[in-house]
């Protein structure tokens, strides 16, 4: 027993809008198009948004999103009470802050009201879909006279839950030098070069004591440090992201 | 076309252990989203462990602590160690893959598994 699935070659890997031409054993009812896939992102603990590609659908259909935790008091599904539309049709939900519980296995089922049978459930662990908001005041000091610290804060998010890539670069420099710094919002510098002027930025990860999530946030705001006098090529402070 | 064949099932002791493999020919699945369920007669299908290809996995309620869902990109092979038996896990054990797009996507519906294996019965004995 074997079931085909027709897909463009191109797209092999990763094509998910997949046509069903026979369905599971013993499964004796017509073959139903998948759903497509839901995606989940918690932003900065403090709304998660679920969200699926609306525009797969053949025809225009208003998709429903329920959910539950797999350890909860009340163990039904619940509707989503805030969708997000693209052109009219949903294509996602806003949870807020009281309803995420961050080590509890997600339960999201995406269903067609018109056609119960199609639906699809998937589990989630959401402490590894956390994007946390850019790092927030980036303040440099002088520790000594070449000495320079870097340090920024981050809001809502325990520090120790927190890892950072650091990004520097001098006018002299083409490429950034950067480096991971594990839960302290800081980083310095020994040795500056007095005549250079130096751009620094920050991102952060819910990485890896709370969370094993791999994305992470925007750049935060550049800072500056330095001469403003020797700005030779002032094209490479265009900052690539 | 996508071939999924099981084996490793059997008849076994309460108690004893099985390992099933699962393997795939005709595409990778390590974009994957990939189940094993089980059917036992008079009984509705359940999924037994379910994982992402980013490498999250899910158990049902009752074999948690005792199976491990594994897989080997390299051989094309999923597996399931089952350990501490007990005899209402007597069913037919299936494989099923989704090509997903998404890392993190794991389904516990069976409707959303585009390809499955024909099966291999595990029978535990008192």
């Known amino acids: 027993w074997s079931s085909k699935v027709l897909m463009s070659s191109a797209n092999e890997d990763i094509k998910a809008d997949l046509i069903l031409t026979s369905t599971a054993p013993e499964h004796l009812s017509a073959p139903t198009l998948p759903l497509p896939e839901v995606q989940c992102f918690v932003f900065n603990i403090e709304y998660m948004n679920c969200t699926w590609n609306s525009s797969s659908e053949p025809q225009a259909t208003n998709l429903t999103l329920h959910y539950r935790y797999k350890v909860s008091d009340n163990n039904t599904f619940q509707e989503c009470s805030h969708y997000l539309f693209s052109k009219e049709i949903t294509s996602g939900c806003q949870i807020q802050k009281e309803d995420i519980q961050l080590y509890q296995t997600f339960v999201v089922q995406l269903q067609d009201p018109q056609k119960p049978q199609r639906r699809a459930v998937q589990k989630l662990n959401l402490q590894n879909l956390v994007i946390p908001r850019a790092p927030e005041n980036l303040t440099l000091s002088n520790l000594s006279e070449s000495q320079l610290e870097l340090r920024w804060k981050s809001r809502h998010i325990k520090e120790r839950c927190l890892q950072y890539l650091v990004q520097y670069r001098s006018n002299r420099d083409r490429s950034w030098t950067e480096l991971i710094v594990n839960h302290e919002p800081r980083f310095s510098l020994p040795s500056v070069d007095e005549l250079k002027r130096y751009t620094f930025r920050v991102r952060s990860r819910y990485n890896p004591i709370c969370g094993s999530s791999q994305q992470w946030s925007k750049w935060s705001q550049p800072v500056h440090w330095g001469s403003h006098t020797v700005e030779e090529n002032p094209s490479l402070f265009a900052l690539e992201a | 076309e996508v071939q999924l064949v099981e084996s490793g099932g059997g008849l076994v002791q309460a108690g004893d252990s099985l390992r099933l493999s699962c393997v795939a020919s005709?595409?990778?699945?390590?974009?994957?989203?990939m189940g094993w369920f089980r059917k036992a007669p008079g009984k509705e299908r359940e999924y037994v462990a379910i994982?992402?290809?980013?490498?999250?996995?899910f158990y049902e309620d009752s074999v948690e602590g005792r199976f491990t869902f594994s897989r080997d990109n390299a051989k094309n092979t999923v597996y399931l160690q089952m350990n501490s038996l007990r005899p209402e896990d007597t069913a037919v054990y299936y494989c099923?893959?989704?090509?997903?797009?998404?890392?993190?996507?794991?389904?516990?519906?069976?409707?959303?598994?585009?390809?499955w294996g024909q099966g291999t019965q595990v029978t535990v004995s008192s």
């Open positions: 099923a893959a989704a090509p997903t797009s998404f890392a993190t996507t794991a389904y516990s519906s069976s409707n959303s598994y585009a390809y």
């Open positions: 994982s992402s290809w980013g490498g999250d996995t």
């Open positions: 005709g595409r990778t699945l390590s974009r994957c989203a």
